[in-house]
């Protein structure tokens, strides 16, 4: 009778992460008597994957009933495959021995490769807000994909951006990879409603590319413009002075009226009106009693927007 051969018919197997890998192995003879073991890798550092005789291998099931006397099919299934399972798997026949079984013959090996989808891209912007005309950086990260080939694009409101740098790590061979990209975006006053999108395409994706988004409303600060105007003199010597606070974002704003440098009133923006571009307008008014003043009055509208240093606009009220 011919000497037993261990046949692993598949040189290579490709499996999607999360699926089950079937590693096929058959023996050509029932002799010699002894168990089969599966290993990942070869040599002294090889990793035991399955032992027919003993041990607990929760992810591994056998294709055939190995307890049957005439069984020569030693194929196994490994469940819930991850990229970390990639490697070459060997089906090894042992001869019954005392005290230990002795390795008799190994199959040629089956290389298991794993394809894994990239994680949903996460886009993060700068920690602090910035004003129009400034350039800000956005980062995009996606992890856990294999193979390494991946494309990443940046868009602002549907327009593709070109000023970005992308790295895929690690540079060498790995079971899975990560991508990290940084894009530079110049802010404009109209960007409150704008979105920055990072788009990742990979061979494993059956749908459109994965997208991560960042709203520029979380990044931009549009400082207000101020205009102080005096309304016609009303009855009882009262003058109505208004401070128009226009085109600001975000809404957080505090306004202080000063009469000749002295605080007259402080209020917080509440009933604002929203512009089409997402910025806000607000108006505050002050009634000034002209008869209480002998000299001209300097009225100042002072605005502190989003914790920034105050900006102000003054108006000289003529007392005639």
């Amino acid at each position: 009778e011919e000497e037993l051969q261990v046949i692993q018919p598949d040189k290579s197997v490709l499996v999607a992460a999360g699926e089950t890998a079937t590693l096929r192995c058959t023996a050509t003879s029932l002799i010699p008597v002894g168990p089969i073991q599966w290993f990942r890798g070869a040599g002294p550092g090889r990793e035991l994957i399955y032992n027919q005789k003993e041990g607990h291998f929760p992810r591994v099931t056998t294709v055939s009933d190995l307890t049957k006397r005439n069984n020569m099919d030693f194929s196994i299934r490994i469940g819930n495959i991850t990229p970390a399972d990639a490697g070459t798997y060997y089906c090894v026949k042992f001869r019954k021995g005392s005290p230990d079984d002795v390795e008799f013959k190994s199959g040629a090996g089956t290389e298991l490769s794993v394809r894994a989808k990239p994680s949903a891209p996460v886009v993060s912007g700068p920690a602090a807000r910035a004003t129009p005309q400034h350039t800000v950086s956005f980062t995009c990260e996606s992890h856990g994909f294999s193979p390494r080939d991946i494309t990443l694009k940046w868009f602002k409101n549907g327009n593709e951006l070109s000023d970005f740098q992308t790295n895929v790590d690690p540079v060498g061979e790995s079971v899975s990879y990560s991508i990290h990209s940084t894009a530079k975006v110049v802010l404009t006053r109209e960007d409150v409603h704008s979105q920055v999108i990072c788009e990742v395409a990979h061979v494993t994706l059956q749908g459109d590319p994965l997208r991560g988004t960042a709203n520029l409303s979380e990044t931009i600060r549009v400082p207000p413009t101020l205009e102080v105007t005096q309304q016609p003199v009303r009855a009882e010597n009262q003058v109505n002075v208004t401070c128009q606070v226009r085109k600001f974002y975000p809404q957080r704003l505090q306004l202080t009226w000063l009469e000749n440098g002295n605080v007259s009133r402080t209020e917080t923006a509440s009933t604002v009106t929203e512009n089409k571009d997402g910025t806000y307008n607000w108006m505050s008014w002050l009634l000034v009693n002209v008869s209480a003043h002998r000299d001209d009055v300097k009225l100042t509208c002072q605005v502190e927007h989003d914790g920034q240093p105050a900006v102000s606009k003054s108006h000289d009220l003529k007392v005639s």
Partner: antibody, heavy 116, light 109 residues
Framework: QSVEESGGRLGQPGTPLTLSCTVS????????MGWFRQAPGKGLEYIGI?????SPYYASWVNGRFTISKTSTTMDLKMNSLRSEDTATYFC?????????????WGPGTLVTVSS | DIQMTQSPSSLSASVGDRVTITCRAS??????LAWYQQKPGKAPKLLIY???FLYSGVPSRFSGSGSGTDFTLTISSLQPEDFATYYC???????????FGQGTKVEIK
């Protein structure tokens, strides 16, 4: 799991024609699907794909001549204005479960003949 | 667009022969290459995907190798049912587009 094309016929130059691809055993919302064609005695030519979410992508030569769309059970190829060079067998196919780089399920094809 | 050049365009061989078909891409496609078999009046059938992986149900006499720009389909021992036309097909991960080789017709000698 299978796919099958229909709608192939004799058509006149300049007229529109719509081919359909009906799938069974799997959902169109889970896989990329593709259209291909093969002129008599010639090789295979890629036309375009539609993603699982319904976005179409076309070969560069298509130039708006064809439109790919889908419903829950069928994928369509609309040929806007037939030309004689469109005479071919048209195949639809599904990409493999491991990725979009290969097609593992093909229909038998449907013949389109363009002649006046 | 990527061009795929298949060679030879046709070959004559006998049952039992070892047959090799090559496919060259005009730029690197890494391992994104598939091989199909097509018989007259029939749809293509997938043989090999990702350059070297044998599709389920395909006899083990078919094998694929290569990466980058140069790829090979080998039939180790030609059988009567293997007489057909064979196509390579690439997928480019940047353009996300597909290209076929022009085909290789394997005929009986």
């Amino acid at each position: 799991q299978s796919v099958e094309e229909s709608g192939g016929r004799l058509g006149q130059p300049g007229t529109p024609l719509t081919l359909s691809c009906t799938v069974s055993g799997f959902s169109l919302s889970s896989y990329v699907m593709g259209w291909f064609r093969q002129a008599p005695g010639k090789g295979l030519e890629y036309i375009g794909i539609i993603s699982s979410s319904g976005s179409p992508y076309y070969a560069s030569w298509v130039n708006g001549r064809f439109t790919i769309s889908k419903t829950s059970t069928t994928m369509d190829l609309k040929m806007n204005s037939l030309r004689s060079e469109d005479t071919a067998t048209y195949f639809c196919a599904r990409v493999g479960p491991l990725g979009v780089d290969y097609f593992n399920i093909w229909g038998p094809g449907t013949l389109v003949t363009v002649s006046s | 667009d990527i061009q795929m050049t298949q060679s030879p365009s046709s070959l004559s061989a006998s049952v039992g022969d070892r047959v090799t078909i090559t496919c060259r891409a005009s730029q690197s496609i890494n391992s994104y290459l598939a091989w199909y078999q097509q018989k007259p009046g029939k749809a293509p059938k997938l043989l090999i995907y990702s350059a070297s992986f044998l599709y389920s149900g395909v006899p083990s006499r078919f094998s694929g190798s290569g990466s980058g720009t140069d790829f090979t389909l080998t039939i180790s021992s030609l059988q009567p049912e293997d007489f057909a036309t064979y196509y390579c097909q690439s997928w480019h991960y940047i353009s996300r587009s597909y290209t076929f080789g022009q085909g290789t017709k394997v005929e009986i000698k």
